[in-house]
Interface confidence: medium
C-alpha cells in the first residue's frame, strides 16, 4: 500500500494531494508544489517537503564538538530544485540568478555565485549532529533510558534503521543525537538520515508532517521531555568550500 486506501490519505506526509486514480483505483498521493508521486509507506524526501512548504499558503565533555567543517542551516527556507527521485539538485538558484551548491540535505556548502557556478556532484551529508537543550526538570534523565527512548523514536516514527543512530550523548540539559550514514551503508529502501533529521526537527517545532498521528510527545519513563532549543550540524563526505571571508 502506498497510501491509506479507505480515506485515501498519506500517513507519512500531510503535504500531499491524494486521489484514487492509481492503477486499479489505488490511492495515489502527490506532493504539493512538485506534483511528484510519493511513497506513503516511508518518509518523503526533504527536498519535496521544502518545495511543498514553499507552495503552501504563507502562514568534562562527553558531548561532541562539531568539526570545523560542520554546516548549520543559516539560510532558512528556499524553494529548491529536486531531481526526478526527489533529491536536491547539486546546484540551486533563486529567481535573481544567484546560485550555490548544496549537500544532500539541501544546506548550502559554497559561497553564492551566478549562473556560471558549477556544482559537479551532490555531496552526501554522512554525519548529522542534533543538539537539543531540554527544559528544566526535577532531576536529570537517566542516560540509558534517554538513549533507548530516542533510538526507539527514530526507529518507530521515522523508520530509521537503528544502526544509523550512532550515539546519544547527555550532559544535562544538553542532549546530542548523532546520525551517521555513509553512501556505502545506505541500502535501497533505507530512510536517509537527512530526511529523518528533518522530520524530527519539524516534530520538535510542533509542525508534524505526519497525517493523523498527533504531534511528537517525547517521554522518558513517563516524564515529558520538552525541548527548548535545537541546533543541527551537518557534516559532508567532502568538506565544504567557502571563502576565508565567510569563515571569519
Amino acid at each position: 500500500h502506498t497510501a491509506a486506501q479507505d480515506n485515501c490519505t498519506c500517513p507519512t506526509n500531510k503535504m500531499t494531494v491524494c486521489s484514487p486514480d492509481g492503477p486499479g483505483g489505488r490511492c495515489q498521493c502527490r506532493a504539493l508544489g512538485s506534483g511528484m508521486a510519493v511513497d506513503c509507506s516511508t518518509l518523503t524526501s526533504k527536498c519535496l517537503l521544502l518545495k511543498a512548504r514553499m507552495s503552501a499558503p504563507k502562514n568534562a565533555r562527553t558531548l561532541v564538538r562539531p568539526s570545523e567543517h560542520a554546516l548549520v542551516d543559516n539560510d532558512g527556507l528556499y524553494d529548491p530544485d529536486c531531481d526526478p527521485e526527489g533529491r536536491f539538485k547539486a546546484r540551486q538558484c533563486n529567481q535573481t540568478s544567484v546560485c550555490w551548491c548544496v549537500n544532500s540535505v539541501g544546506v548550502r556548502r559554497t559561497d553564492k555565485g551566478d549562473l556560471s557556478l558549477r556544482c559537479d556532484e551532490l555531496v552526501r551529508t554522512h554525519h548529522i549532529l542534533i543538539d537539543l537543550r531540554h527544559r528544566p526538570t526535577a532531576g536529570a534523565f537517566n542516560h540509558s533510558d534517554l538513549d533507548a527512548e530516542l533510538r526507539r523514536l527514530f526507529r518507530e516514527r521515522y523508520r530509521l534503521h537503528p544502526k544509523f543512530v550512532a550515539a546519544v550523548h547527555y550532559e544535562q540539559p544538553t542532549i546530542q543525537i548523532e546520525l551517521r550514514q555513509n553512501t556505502s551503508q545506505k541500502a535501497a529502501g533505507d530512510v536517509d538520515i537527512g530526511d529523518a533529521a528533518y522530520y524530527f526537527e519539524r516534530d520538535i517545532k510542533g509542525e508534524s508532517l505526519f497525517q493523523g498521528r498527533g504531534g511528537l510527545d517525547l517521554r522518558v519513563r513517563g516524564e515529558p521531555l520538552q525541548v527548548e532549543r535545537t541546533l543541527i550540524y551537518y557534516l559532508d563526505e567532502i568538506p565544504p568550500k567557502f571563502s576565508m571571508k565567510r569563515l571569519t
Epitope: H1, E156, R157, G212, G214, G215, R219
Partner: antibody
Amino acid sequence: QIQLVQSGHEVKKPGASVKVSCKASGYTFTNYGMNWVRQAPGQGLEWMGWINTKTGEPTYAEEFKGRFVFSLETSASTAYLQISSLKAEDMAMYFCGRGGYGSSYWYFDVWGQGTTVTVSS
Amino acid sequence: DIQMTQSPSSLSASVGDRVTITCKASQDVSIAVAWYQQKPGKAPKVLIYSASYRYTGVPDRFSGSGSGTDFTFTISSLQPEDIAVYYCQQHYITPLTFGGGTKVEIK
C-alpha cells in the same frame, strides 16, 4: 499509585442517555490523553477515540461520531463518556485508557476497571 | 482504516510450552504494535509496545517481534496464570485498531 477509577454499572432503557466517568489519580491528568474503548459481550476491543486533556478537544473514530461525547472536568481529574439515544447495540463494557499525544504513545498503559452499560426495555 | 488480522483465534497448550501468536497489519505500521493480555471480567494490561519493548514489570517470558506488516507475540514457557485473551493493537495512526484476539487455554 497511578489508577483510573470508573463509575458503576448502568442499566438504561432504549432512547435514554448515560454518562460514564473515569477519575484519574497518581499522575498529572493533563500530561496524558484519555482514550475510550468499547467491548461488546464476547467480542474484541474497539477504539472509540480520545480526548486531549490539555485542550479538551475530542477525536472520535468514525463509528462513534454523533451520539457519543467525550468531556472533561479537569479540576477533578475526570474524563466523561456520554452516550445519548441508547440502542441495544450500545450494550457493552466501556473502558477508559491512558495514552499520550504523539504516535509513540498511542498504546494504553493504564486502564479503568470498565463500566458495563446494559440497555433493556 | 488499518486492519489487524490476528491468528489463531484460540489455542490450547500445555504448561511450559512455547506459544506464538501472529498479527498481520493491512498496511505498514513501522514497529508501532502493542500486545495486551485480558483476563475474564478485567481490563486489558499492556505487555509489549513498539513491537518488542516489554512494558515495566512484565515477565521476560513474554516477548514480541516484527516490523512493517508482520508481528509475532511469544510466551516462551506457558504458565497457568497466562490463561487469557491476547490482543494486538497498532499504535501507528488513528483510528487505532485491535486484532480480533487469541484465547489461550491450558490443555
